[in-house]
């Protein structure tokens, strides 16, 4: 069978959801609860921000960043960056996956206002067995966690 | 076969579209059109603005509503809020699933500005047979109708 | 099987990519990488632009365009309108799949304000075998191409 | 804790009116679609109404329409079944019940209408 | 109007024993719509089963719901003293709720 993933065991799939120590201020990709309320495991494996493909194959991954503020942060770039990133033994660096790029902050007109924004991702990629995806955004100052219902990231096998 | 349904069973999917009846102006969830157009039920039943889940799985359930306006009207918050939700007789309350804030008329600068956004939502939820999900938006007001593809609400088993 | 493509064969999916020839200028639809980098077919066509279905059934499809700019165009509309379109031999026009409507230059308050925004469409619809979806966007002058990682088009069946 | 309390019922003659009221509370009302179920002495459960939660689609049984009329004040958590023209058939212990789907989840106490010459 | 008939209309059986409940509509009934009930006498009706085979909270799992289109079980595998009540199925369809007539539960 081509796909005898399909008639003989479970289709991977996860939903990791933001949670309060998604946020590390250290650079590195966000982290994310992987038991708790929503978010599951299924036939994937997860490992520091990352989830980690057990079975190769095309998976559509997704991820959603709640965005918001009071006007712009001192020394902000008009930019945020989200995105889905893989790592692979095969390559040294990460490699994009899907990537947005917004402007929220311009949405604030006076430096009071208070503004929301969100960013969602979703596409099919190549996923070998061992390979991680991650979630970063940049500048992650602006994004609002509260109960894993605004920010998520998660895949499943297609 | 831990994933029966994959071999025997058509896969669980719906896609239905906003009409002109989906904003009852009531504070209840968005109703949809079920059968006309693009829209679809098979494996899945609706009600009253419902998706009711008839074989219990994961689900990538998804939205998308059309946001426009001129300006802000007079008293809106400055916040709009697109989610989906659960209810489930398991739980007393609805449960929040997945949920996006957005601040679309703070990008119009003056009051005669028209202005358009859109809200996207999708992920991975695990669903009992005979529960429902729905979708609310708050303040519904500002949703714009057309014709199916720019307000919509959809799930797959995955 | 009513579902004998899950058990015996590949299931039909998709992802392309933005590339510089994307963007035409003529008032068609975009164009996409197939092959290289992230991009692939698997039991789905192309063909000038359009994905086409090689095996009917219900398809999620999805695409994210990258907006950006400095201010606003000169005489361009306060409307970005990025859709996906399907085209049959059963009707002469295209016909709108799922749509969406922006006013990302708004967000800028000034002329040399430089912006970024992002569109991201996906649904459940039903394709026969033989059909092509396409991607528009008007005004496609918007669209910010890079690597193949902020603007795609993809879909699978579900 | 979620609690549905029935109120109003009572003696009435063939062909009077009487209202039966239902006060919820422990959920969010204003949610969820509400029900009224009633059961005949030493009978079965005969559904009787339904509304959504914002009052936009409402149901009757067959033996009820053009008699009995279901509202609900969501700013009061409140449900009410106003019942006109009744007959003998009509006695019964009248219950409110939330629905999900098909399922009626919580169920009041229920209020015994008895319709008697 | 869609018609469940409940059988058997009495049931008598002994703590320990397992007990099997049919509930037959005279037409297709969506699975996500049917639903089963306890009710004791003096008492309102209490949820059982949601959507064919979904045991709602508290629900001991001796207590399992199956069945599609128009044949439904509810089955108790083991009685329990406690069990011993009328047992209704109900669904939705067309607009309106119907309830079979129940089924006694009675002990022997």
């Known amino acids: 069978l081509i796909q005898e993933r399909r008639s003989h065991e479970v289709n991977p799939a996860a939903h990791l959801t933001g949670a309060n120590s998604s946020l590390t201020g250290s650079g590195g990709p966000l982290l994310w609860e992987t038991q708790l309320g929503l978010a599951f495991l299924r036939g994937l494996s997860y490992h520091d921000g990352a989830l980690v493909v057990t079975k190769a194959g095309y998976y559509y991954i997704y991820s959603k960043v709640q965005l918001g503020g009071v006007g712009c942060p001192l020394g902000l770039a008009s930019t945020i960056t989200h995105g889905l990133y893989k790592r692979t033994p095969r390559y040294p660096e990460e490699l994009e996956l899907l990537v947005s790029q917004q402007s929220p902050c311009g949405r604030a007109t006076s430096s009071s206002r208070v503004w929301w924004d969100s960013s969602f991702l979703g596409g099919v990629v190549h996923l070998e067995a061992g390979e991680e995806v991650v979630v970063r955004v940049l500048d992650e100052r602006l994004v609002r966690l509260r109960d894993g219902t605004r920010s998520y990231f998660g895949a499943f096998m297609v | 076969l831990i994933q029966e349904r994959r071999s025997h069973e058509v896969n669980p999917a719906a896609h239905l579209t906003g009409a002109n009846s989906s904003l009852t102006g009531s504070g209840g969830p968005l109703l949809w059109e079920t059968q006309l157009g693009l829209a679809f039920l098979r494996g899945l039943s609706y009600h009253d603005g419902a998706l009711v889940v008839t074989k219990a799985g994961y689900y990538y359930i998804y939205s998308k509503v059309q946001l426009g306006g001129v300006g802000c009207p007079l008293g809106l918050a400055s916040t709009i809020t697109h989610g989906l939700y659960k209810r489930t007789p398991r739980y007393p309350e609805e449960l929040e699933l997945l949920v996006s804030q957005q601040s679309p008329c703070g990008r119009a600068t003056s009051s005669s500005r028209v202005w358009w956004d859109s809200s996207f939502l999708g992920g991975v939820v695990h669903l009992e047979a005979g529960e429902e999900v729905v979708v609310r938006v708050l303040d519904e007001r500002l949703v714009r109708l057309r014709d199916g593809t720019r307000s919509y609400f959809g799930a797959f088993m995955v | 099987l009513i579902q004998e493509r899950r058990s015996h064969e590949v299931n039909p999916a998709a992802h392309l990519t933005g590339a510089n020839s994307s963007l035409t200028g003529s008032g068609g639809p975009l164009l996409w990488e197939t092959q290289l980098g992230l991009a692939f077919l698997r039991g789905l066509s192309y063909h000038d632009g359009a994905l086409v279905v090689t095996k009917a059934g219900y398809y999620y499809i999805y695409s994210k365009v990258q907006l950006g700019g400095v201010g606003c165009p000169l005489g361009l509309a306060s409307t970005i309108t990025h859709g996906l379109y399907k085209r049959t031999p059963r009707y002469p026009e295209e016909l709108e799949l799922l749509v969406s409507q922006q006013s990302p230059c708004g967000r800028a308050t000034s002329s040399s304000r430089v912006w970024w925004d992002s569109s991201f469409l996906g649904g459940v619809v039903h394709l026969e075998a033989g059909e092509e979806v396409v991607v528009r966007v008007l005004d496609e002058r918007l669209v910010r191409l890079r690597d193949g990682t902020r603007s795609y088009f993809g879909a699978f069946m579900v | 804790e979620v609690q549905l309390v029935e109120s109003g019922g009572g003696l009435v003659q063939p062909g009077g009116s009487l209202r039966l009221s239902c006060a919820a509370s422990g959920f969010t009302f204003s949610r969820f679609n509400m029900n009224w179920v009633r059961q005949a002495p030493g009978k079965g459960l005969e559904w009787v109404s339904y509304i959504s939660s914002s009052s936009y689609t409402i149901y009757y049984a067959d033996s009820v329409k053009g008699r009995f009329t279901i509202s609900r004040d969501n700013a009061k958590n409140s449900l009410d079944l106003q019942m006109n023209s009744l007959r003998d058939e009509d006695t019964a212990v009248y219950y409110c019940?939330?629905?999900?789907?098909?399922?009626?989840?919580?169920w009041g106490q229920g209020a015994l209408v008895t319709v008697s010459s | 109007e869609i018609v469940l008939t409940q059988s058997p209309g009495t049931l008598s059986l002994s703590p320990g024993e397992r007990a099997t409940l049919s509930c037959r509509a005279s037409?297709?009934?969506?699975?996500?719509?049917l639903t089963w009930y306890q009710q004791k006498p003096g008492q309102a009706p209490r949820l059982l089963i949601y959507g064919a085979s979904s045991r709602a909270t508290g629900i001991p799992d001796r207590f399992s719901g199956s069945g599609s289109g128009t044949d439904f079980t509810l089955t108790i595998s083991r009685l329990e003293p406690e069990d011993f009540a009328v047992y209704y199925c109900?669904?939705?369809?067309?607009?309106?709720?119907?309830f079979g007539q129940g089924t006694k539960l009675e002990i022997k």
């Open positions: 019940a939330r629905s999900i789907a098909a399922a009626f989840d919580y």
């Open positions: 109900q669904q939705y369809g067309s607009s309106m709720y119907t």
């Open positions: 037409q297709s009934v969506s699975s996500s719509y």
